[in-house]
Amino acid sequence: MKVLQEPTCVSDYMSISTCEWKMNGPTNCSTELRLLYQLVFLLSEAHTCIPENNGGAGCVCHLLMDDVVSADNYTLDLWAGQQLLWKGSFKPSEHVKPRAPGNLTVHTNVSDTLLLTWSNPYPPDNYLYNHLTYAVNIWSENDPADFRIYNVTYLEPSLRIAASTLKSGISYRARVRAWAQCYNTTWSEWSPSTKWHNSYREPFEQ
């Protein structure tokens, strides 16, 4: 049994890091493999992650972490029984994938304005809380070409757009994702999408 693609990990910079790797053949990850991880820190304890299958030869493990900070560095050991298959390390702050924003809501009761709001996925005491920026994707269910991205570079998790920038009388969907420049993160996953019917009064023409 050998590792074909070494584990690569990303951290949500809060409580979970996800590591993925591929074996050289079909593997029952949860029964045959264990990923041991330990913070390189005084008094730290070793933890064991039981991987799950991710395709025939792929495995994925969700590592639980407390109080993640930029100085943290973890040792990783991948075991198959008594055999050490791979040894590496992982610094969560250098491989951050933020959590996806939640609770995306479209408020259509403001005159001729659409207000989109969502929730910041981090608590106020997490460093990323004040450093996320967002991308909002709005698209038409009827017209695949009607697809747009709004970059939200301010901290408030909201976006106002004129309803008239979208077509009236049809349904739209929106979703939002986040990233943080400070840690050069990747984009988060998209939030679940929300749907609304866009309607507004056309301006009266003489």
């Epitope: 005084l42 407390d66 109080d67 930029s70």
Partner: antibody, heavy 116, light 111 residues
Framework: QVQLVQSGAEVKKPGASVKVSCKAS????????MHWARQAPGQGLEWMGI????????SYAQKFQGRVTMTRDTSTSTVYMELSSLRSEDTAVYYC?????????WGKGTLVTVSS | QSVLTQPPSVSAAPGQKVTISCSGG????????VSWYQQLPGTAPKLLIY???KRPSGIPDRFSGSKSGTSATLAITGLQTGDEADYYC????????????FGTGTKLTVL
């Protein structure tokens, strides 16, 4: 919000021991290390040691080795710092502080006076 | 005695800028991150800066930190009378046994 509530002031005689408590609330107690530091009157801060509330293991500054013991009670989310063989120069305010590489939150401090 | 050296005192007028230095060595500041703590008279220390230059939520951006080599600096702009306090740098040293030294402390007086 995070709160670290420390026990009240103590007056001790030289040679005696003192045990200071620090009750934590507002966060997952076993997820954060706890430091202890002290400050003698008019002096600076001095680090004493650190405890991992998850497993209960502790490590102490070399200066205090053999005289200090840090423990925890997960059922009450409380950490303790016991200092023995007290001498007059141990008169200080003792602080618990939550954190790993740095101290996010501090208790208000416990004044320990050592006097004959 | 502390292995991190700070000036005993600094002073400046309201609205001015002041800097406080913290000098260490290769086994502590040179190999770790620096934090800064503010201690108002009669109160417990409070975290002001961590990770060399990050501010906890609620700390105004008048406070900033930087690190270069084995030294670190705390800068305070737009000084206010309420900033009058003792300031301590801190770091950790894992070269032999792990220890968390604090700086000698600096008394800031707002004139």
């Amino acid at each position: 919000q995070v709160q670290l509530v420390q026990s009240g002031a103590e007056v001790k005689k030289p040679g005696a021991s003192v045990k200071v408590s620090c009750k934590a609330s507002g966060y997952a107690f076993t997820s954060y290390y706890m430091h202890w530091a002290r400050q003698a009157p008019g002096q600076g801060l001095e680090w004493m040691g650190i405890i991992n509330p998850s497993g209960g293991s502790a490590s102490y500054a070399q200066k205090f080795q053999g005289r200090v013991t840090m423990t925890r009670d997960t059922s009450t989310s409380t950490v303790y710092m016991e200092l023995s063989s007290l001498r007059s120069e141990d008169t200080a305010v003792y602080y618990c502080a939550r954190g790993k590489y740095w101290m996010y939150d501090w208790g208000k401090g416990t004044l320990v006076t050592v006097s004959s | 005695q502390s292995v991190l050296t700070q000036p005993p005192s600094v002073s400046a007028a309201p609205g001015q800028k002041v800097t406080i230095s913290c000098s260490g060595g290769s086994s502590n500041i040179g190999n770790s991150y620096v934090s800064w703590y503010q201690q108002l008279p009669g109160t417990a220390p409070k975290l002001l800066i961590y990770d060399n230059n990050k501010r906890p939520s609620g700390i105004p951006d008048r406070f900033s930190g930087s690190k270069s080599g084995t030294s670190a600096t705390l800068a305070i702009t737009g000084l206010q009378t309420g900033d009058e306090a003792d300031y301590y740098c801190g770091t950790w040293d894992s070269s032999t046994v792990w220890e968390w030294p604090f700086g000698t402390g600096t008394k800031l007086t707002v004139l």
